[in-house]
């Protein structure tokens, strides 16, 4: 007894096509590109029916249903727009990812299409959604010429500035990603095994302001070449935050130096350092203060410290800054803060130095402030961030 002639479902075809189908004859259904086999609610990888001896097929005809990529992933710090139509997620539908303007940026154009494999796919063939990376190095600060001592910072001047509070100590750091803080190893060394006891505040100008964004450390990474109490070589550390902070006008990462940045940190080039450390009056600053200071000649700086503190070495991993006449320097409590420079080409600020050490007499004539030379540690920073997660570091020339 023959089985009834099978009729191909819409958007599908049958093979083989026969004049008559008898016992044990079979046919398969194939869907055209962009459609999938569906039996009720169940997607099938393949479909073959067999003619039974009672003249019926052993299974009902499936349908060829348009591929549905489903709702796209949410985009942290961004959003997705449906281009084809509201909530349309089927084959060849188009969506557009975009990041929150000003503070986040996307490497791709953000356009994704629902493809036949059921994945949202970018024009480059990427199946994963894009990432909104924080913009770095935007500031309202302008280099202010001949200032003696410090000046109070204004909102948006140093949005990367981070206050690190221990039970009895205070230091600084610089946000370099939405969940990484760069600081000096000596400033967090005692906390390395008890990261959670470090209180991290950002988005503030007043040191004691109650309106701060709180961040908690997950782990502290001290440079393996740093030896506590035996000089300040490799005085650099990274703090991974438990959660990503939201980037805005008062909280933003500073950029890391690109390779070409070395030319912007030559002798007499001006950088800026900010902090809540001791001021000329010998008291901790209530308001975030900053000072614009020139890079000092490395040989001069080395000679000064050889004379002042025999056995303390100014290494090639350090840079010195300050005036021969003195008066402009970082001081105790500023440790770990960033010495930043403006990249004229990109108009972004990058971290060139980390407040490390100096003369006991801050700002004394002929006694420079010594900073960790960040450009020497880019591979170390990138390695830590890529191995321990939470997004890549920000080189401002990417933007």
């Amino acid at each position: 007894r023959p089985c009834p002639d099978p009729t191909a479902p819409p958007n599908g075809s049958i093979s083989p096509v026969q004049a008559i189908y008898v016992l044990k004859d079979r046919f398969s259904v194939f869907c055209k590109t962009g459609f999938e086999l569906l039996q009720g609610s169940v997607p099938l990888k393949s479909f073959t029916a067999v003619c039974q001896k009672d003249g019926s097929w052993d299974r009902p005809m499936p349908e060829c249903s348009i591929i549905d990529c489903g709702p796209p992933d949410d985009l942290p710090n961004g959003h997705v727009d449906y281009i084809t139509g509201p909530e349309v997620t089927t084959y060849k539908a188009v969506i557009q990812y975009s990041c929150e303007e000003t503070f986040y940026t996307m490497s791709s154009n953000g356009k994704y299409v629902c493809e036949a494999d059921g994945f949202w796919t970018s024009s480059k063939g990427e199946k994963l959604p894009p990432v909104c990376e924080p913009v770095c190095g935007l500031s309202t600060h302008t280099i202010g010429g001949q200032i003696v001592g410090g000046q109070p910072a204004k909102p948006g001047d140093f949005p990367w500035q981070v206050l690190l509070l221990g039970q009895t100590t205070a230091a600084a750091g610089a946000l370099i990603h939405d969940n990484w803080v760069l600081t000096a190893a000596h400033a967090v060394y005692e906390k390395r095994m008890a990261a959670s006891s470090l209180n991290i505040r950002m988005g503030i100008l007043k040191r004691l302001s109650p309106h701060y964004t709180q961040a908690w450390p997950e782990e502290i990474f001290i440079h393996e070449g740093y030896t506590h109490g035996a000089g300040f070589d490799n005085d650099i550390a990274l703090i991974k935050l438990k959660n990503k902070v939201t980037i805005n006008g008062s909280i933003m990462p500073v950029c890391l130096p690109r390779k070409e940045a070395a030319s912007l940190m030559r002798t007499d080039f001006t950088g800026t350092v900010a902090g809540w450390g001791l001021t000329q009056k010998g008291l901790l600053a209530r308001n975030l203060m900053f000072v614009d200071i020139p890079i000092a000649d490395h040989q001069k700086c080395t000679a000064v410290y050889e004379k002042l503190y025999p056995g303390v070495r100014v290494s090639a991993n350090m840079l010195c800054a300050g005036l021969e006449t003195g008066g402009k320097d970082a001081c105790r409590g500023d440790s770990g803060g960033a010495l930043v420079f403006l990249d004229n080409e990109t108009q972004r600020w990058f971290v060139g130095g980390i407040v490390s050490w100096g003369s006991i007499n801050c700002g004394a004539a002929d006694q420079y402030g010594v900073y960790t030379k960040v450009i020497n540690y880019i591979p170390w920073i990138e390695n830590i961030i890529s191995n321990f997660g939470g997004g890549g570091s920000h080189h401002h020339h990417h933007h």
Partner: antibody
Framework: QVQLQESGPGLVKPSETLSLTCTVS??????????WGWIRQPPGKGLEWIGS???????YYNPSLKSRVTISVDTSKNQFSLKLSSVTAADTAVYYC??????????WGQGTMVTVSS | SYELMQPPSMSVSPGQTASITCSGD??????AYWYQQKPGQSPVLVIY???KRPSGIPERFSGSNSGNTATLTISGTQAMDEADYYC?????????FGGGTKLTVLG
């Protein structure tokens, strides 16, 4: 965001009929994209699919339970229901309702514990 | 009736890769689905149609299915991944679940 909520008696006597309702909020049960399913989980054991229904009323059931199961839909109330007859202690379980989108159950209700005991 | 078999339990150290298997006759010919269930909570879909991740599921979850075995892989396993994991498939329009695997994250 669609949410599902199971409701019904927590205690049923042996040989009686277990009746549960799942209320769908944040989306229409009449969407052509979805079936709606029931799954259960006896205490400390694994998951067992009971059956699924389309808004038009077409159903498919687990063959091992088919003779005792009825799933129905009420589109006006945005609900679907489960009836399981002739229950025994072996039917004691957490009963979940879930949206069945192309064979995948997502999301699930929070589940309701039903104990069969005299 | 169709059966899906899973190892009852397995353990993994944080940061390591966990591979949970599910075996069934010619399982690779049909789609496999994976659900995560934490104590006292409803199951959550983590992989569908062998290897697709629903919105909101971390990238560390991935799936594969060929021959008689489907595998759920969790790379860089975290403490929060400790849960029961169930595979599921449809055979002749009947939903079938595996017995579940209890994943313990050590430490």
């Amino acid at each position: 965001q669609v949410q599902l909520q199971e409701s019904g008696p927590g205690l049923v006597k042996p040989s009686e009929t277990l009746s549960l309702t799942c209320t769908v909020s944040g989306g229409s049960i009449s969407s052509s994209s979805y079936y709606w399913g029931w799954i259960r989980q006896p205490p400390g054991k694994g998951l067992e699919w009971i059956g699924s229904i389309y808004y038009s009323g077409s159903t498919y059931y687990n063959p091992s339970l088919k003779s005792r199961v009825t799933i129905s839909v009420d589109t006006s109330k945005n609900q679907f229901s489960l009836k399981l007859s002739s229950v025994t202690a072996a039917d004691t379980a957490v009963y979940y309702c879930a949206r069945d989108r192309r064979g995948r159950f997502d999301p699930w209700g929070q589940g309701t514990m039903v104990t069969v005991s005299s | 009736s169709y059966e899906l078999m899973q190892p009852p339990s397995m353990s993994v150290s944080p940061g390591q890769t966990a591979s949970i298997t599910c075996s069934g006759d010619k399982l690779g010919d049909i789609y496999a689905y994976w659900y995560q269930q934490k104590p006292g909570q409803s199951p959550v879909l983590v992989i569908y149609q062998d290897n697709k991740r629903p919105s909101g599921i971390p990238e560390r979850f991935s799936g594969s299915n060929s021959g008689n075995t489907a595998t759920l892989t969790i790379s860089g396993t975290q403490a929060m991944d400790e849960a029961d994991y169930y595979c599921q498939a449809w055979e002749s329009s009947t939903g079938v679940f595996g017995g579940g695997t209890k994943l313990t994250v050590l430490g």
